[in-house]
Interface confidence: low
């Protein structure tokens, strides 16, 4: 067969179903690797095909489209289940191509089963609540354009295992979910079933995510350098360890950069001399509020580094802050029985 | 110095507005707390204001009873519907470091007096 | 909520002797942020001890602040009648923002 444009294991797009469910799965193609869609391609003379790889098989085979009842059907540029079986899982792959021209992408679809509370291997999408922020809500994801807009579904929340209602600040409203002000004990998974009828069937969707309660901008402030302070002072006998942390505190912003670096005479430390190393460690508090701990590290400091300035930086999308940490040489104590001989004028 | 003012005798369901003045340091680097001493009784801490951000935290138990907000010489504690359990001497405090940080408080105002009673 | 218990309420002690008050919390204190204040009747509260031990200016060395985590103890060496007050923890706790906590305060009374 002539070339064709192979945009190989589109693995980044592992897809995850559930089964014995509904699935609608969109030829990749056109939403990530080319720069025109399913209608243009269509009225350009291209056709679509499809085909896939059972798990643990090399071998490339053609969809079975006369299933019973349309279990498996394509309508423009989907691949629909109606529903998915276990056995399903393996690699797709949708081609779009004619006499001159042709492209394709392979794709992972995973078919995963789920316990009575809902519990699977599916990755979970991660939905952020800010805590005591008022009303805010979820909504049902990924059910769009498996029923037509005539059709109304019953739609049933669960809280982990349990039925959401009578639940003090949660309210099931349809597609959404409203937390009426919500707290850390919010935290969990959240799944929606949406149940519909479909000619003379009834399909369920099951959508589970995890509601992550974190910080609320309006508690957010600038970083907080900790340390250094102005209550400890790393005063070191030249030859001794150097170790300094700069610890910073970061509230919780959404998409924010947080950063913390040292300067040394007002240089990073990659552009002096000196053999400094520099260790970070990262802890978050339950509303992901950040503190990052960055220890600069000297292991025979000189008499030269004791003199030098050591400022630690911290930025982060509410600002950027310094702070000098205070370094000085030790003073020796005195060589006691020496200065008392020279004190009584021995020579 | 820190001192407060505003302090009087309120009807329950009224509403009380105390300030706290200051001078010799920018409230804009230092935090600054509201507490509250009911008579014979502890120390309770009712929120802070950090006013070079902006940002304010209450008590879990304030539950939108008493806001804090800030001029730039001033820390104002707005109480709305008291009631007789709000009955004390609230203190306002400065942080003792610049920078906003959790040490302590080391610069306190003598207190004023609520006293809540129809 | 956070709770911070003090122990013992009262203690009693002579001049000379020493005096020793705990501060448990409920959970860890951020960074060890725990301070000690001193309060007499109609006055306003005066800090002692800010992060666990750091002595506060002008307060006298016989005051002594120690401790980690959940755990912390203040220790009032040679006590002497000017010491005759209560004497509250406060913590600050970091989770929404930054959170403060007293202690229910520990009366010392001096003979």
């Known amino acids: 067969s002539e070339r064709c444009d192979d945009w190989g294991l589109d693995t980044m797009r592992q897809i995850q179903v559930f089964e014995d469910e509904p699935a609608r799965i969109k030829c990749p193609l056109f939403e990530h690797f080319l720069k025109f869609n399913y209608s243009t391609a269509h009225s350009a003379g291209l056709t679509l095909i499809w085909y896939w790889t059972r798990q643990d098989r090399d071998l490339e085979e053609p969809i079975n489209f006369r299933l019973p009842e349309n279990r498996i059907s394509k309508e423009k540029d989907v691949l629909w289940f109606r529903p998915t079986l276990l056995n399903d899982t393996g690699n797709y792959t949708c081609m779009l191509r004619n006499t001159t021209y042709c492209s394709k992408v392979a794709f992972p679809l995973e078919v995963v089963q789920k316990d009575s509370c809902f519990n699977s291997p599916m990755k979970l999408p991660v939905h952020k609540l800010y805590i005591e922020y008022g009303i805010q809500r979820i909504t049902c994801p990924n059910v769009d354009g498996y029923f037509p807009s005539s059709v109304k579904p019953t739609i049933t929340w669960y809280m982990g295992c349990y039925k959401i209602q009578n639940f003090n600040n949660v309210i099931p409203e349809g597609m959404n979910l409203s937390f009426l002000i919500a707290l850390i004990s919010n935290n969990g998974n959240y799944t929606c079933v949406v149940t519909y009828p479909e000619n003379g069937r009834t399909f369920h969707l099951t959508r589970t995510l995890t509601v992550k309660v974190v910080g609320s901008p309006k508690n957010a402030v600038p970083p907080v350098i900790h340390s250094p302070n102005d209550h400890v002072v790393y005063e070191k006998e030249p030859g001794e360890e150097l170790l300094i942390p700069c610890t910073v505190y970061f509230s919780f912003l959404m998409d924010s950069r947080n950063e913390v670096w040292w300067t040394i005479d007002g240089k990073k430390p990659d552009d002096i001399t000196i053999d400094v190393t520099i260790n970070e460690s990262i802890s978050h508090s339950r509303t992901e509020d950040e503190t990052r701990t960055q220890i600069l590290s000297i292991k025979k400091v000189t008499s030269e580094d004791l003199k030098r300035s050591y400022v630690c930086h911290a930025r982060s999308a509410k600002g950027e802050v310094a702070k000098a940490a205070k370094v000085k040489q030790k003073v020796p104590a005195p060589r006691y029985t020496v200065e008392l001989a020279c004190g009584f004028g021995a020579t | 110095s820190v001192e407060e003012s505003g302090g009087r005798l309120v009807t329950p369901g009224g509403s009380l507005t105390l300030t706290c003045t200051v001078s010799g340091f920018s409230l804009s680097i230092y935090a600054m707390g509201w507490f509250r001493q009911a008579p014979g009784k502890g120390l309770e801490w009712i929120g802070d204001?950090?006013?070079?951000?902006?940002s304010t935290w209450y008590a879990s138990w304030v539950k939108g009873r008493f806001t804090i907000s800030s001029t730039s010489t001033t820390v104002d504690l707005k109480i709305t519907s008291p009631t007789t359990e709000d009955t004390a001497t609230y203190f306002c405090a400065r942080e003792i470091d610049a920078g906003y940080v959790g040490y302590g408080f080391n610069l306190w105002g003598q207190g004023t007096l609520v006293t809540v009673s129809s | 909520a956070q709770a911070l218990t003090q122990t013992p309420s009262s203690v009693s002690a002579a001049v000379g002797g020493t005096v020793t008050i705990n501060c448990q919390s409920s959970?860890?204190?951020?960074?060890?942020?725990l301070a000690w204040y001193q309060q007499k009747p109609g006055q306003p509260p005066k800090l002692l001890i800010y992060w666990a031990s750091k002595l506060a200016s002008g307060v006298p060395s016989r005051f002594k602040g120690s401790g980690s985590g959940t755990q912390f103890t203040l220790t009032i060496s040679g006590v002497q009648s000017d010491d005759a007050a209560t004497y509250y923890c406060q913590a600050t706790y970091n989770g929404r923002g930054w959170y403060r906590a007293f202690g229910e305060g520990t009366e010392v009374v001096v003979k």
């Open positions: 959970q860890s204190v951020y960074s060890d942020y």
């Open positions: 204001i950090y006013a070079g951000s902006g």
